[in-house]
């Protein structure tokens, strides 16, 4: 699958704003912003 | 390739209880808030839970129509989310789907009947 | 909770006119930071939604752009400039402000 979110716009990707009385910061926890990052997930300890 | 793709839909009687697994893959899942959403047979789209990442103390929100009845979780070992539901009413007959909100499975098959 | 409501719930087009779905929130989806929290998908025939348009205007990757989104706080429209084979589904929009989290009803769009 191609990545559905436009790259050149992804700094605020997901931010919903307010919920409850506080602020859900999607952009920073998206599918599409976690490709970008480029993180790698630590592997299970075994 | 981003997959995530939904397992455990089945037919169940009124009351019972099952369990979905979402296995994600292709992205780095542990810092991801993930949601299930479900599709009513009249195909209305309805949002359920939401899970958040570790560092948010895997805070968890449901709709009204589920609270207290379905459980969200997730195993970032697995990179997967469940949704375990119990009291299963024969509303929550529909296609059940796990989603970023940007990328979203294949759906699974959830129908509640006697 | 935030209500969405979508007009026209059904749309037949000739392939190559241009079609508009309204959506109409009964809140303000104006967000922190100007962020208007409104979204559009669609979804074919057989499949899962697929994000066309994200804070009400702005085009997801992969999407052609024929397609665009327009609004104020409350009231939106997507737009399809020059209706193809592929468009064909079901449009929904949806918001991400406000839990619960709440979709239109869906616009069905047919060809003619």
């Known amino acids: 699958l191609a990545d559905p979110l436009d790259h050149r716009d992804a700094g605020d990707l997901w931010f919903p704003g307010e919920s409850e009385s506080f602020e859900d910061a999607h952009v920073e926890h998206s599918i599409s912003r976690s490709l970008l990052e480029g993180e790698i997930p630590f592997p299970p300890t075994s | 390739e981003v997959q995530l793709v939904e397992t455990g839909g089945s037919l169940v009687q009124p009351g019972k209880s099952l369990k979905l697994t979402c296995a994600t893959s292709?992205?780095?899942?542990?810092?991801?808030?993930m949601h299930w959403v479900r599709q009513s047979p009249e195909k209305q789209l309805e949002w359920i839970a939401h899970?958040?990442?570790?560092?948010?103390?895997?805070?968890?929100y449901y709709a009204e129509s589920v609270k207290g009845r379905f459980t969200i979780s997730r195993d970032d070992s697995k990179t997967s989310i469940y949704l375990q539901m119990n009291s299963l009413k024969e509303d929550d007959t529909a296609i059940y789907y796990c989603?970023?909100?940007?990328?979203w499975g294949q759906g699974v098959m959830v129908t509640v009947s006697s | 909770d935030t209500v969405l409501t979508q007009a026209p719930l059904s749309l037949s087009v000739t392939p190559g006119e241009s079609a508009s779905i309204s959506c109409r929130s009964s809140k303000s989806l104006l967000g922190v930071r100007d962020i208007t929290s409104l979204y559009w998908y669609l979804q074919k025939p057989g499949k899962s939604p697929q994000l066309l348009i994200y804070r009400m205007s702005n085009l997801a990757s992969g999407v052609p752009d024929r397609f665009s989104g327009s609004g104020s706080e409350t009231d939106f429209t997507l737009k399809i400039s020059e209706v193809e084979t592929e468009d064909v589904g079901v449009y929904y929009c949806a918001q991400f402000l406000r839990y619960p989290y709440t979709f239109g009803p869906g616009t069905k769009l047919e060809l003619k």
């Open positions: 292709g992205f780095p899942f542990s810092n991801v808030w």
């Open positions: 899970i958040k990442a570790k560092s948010d103390n895997y805070a968890t």
């Open positions: 989603t970023g909100l940007d990328y």
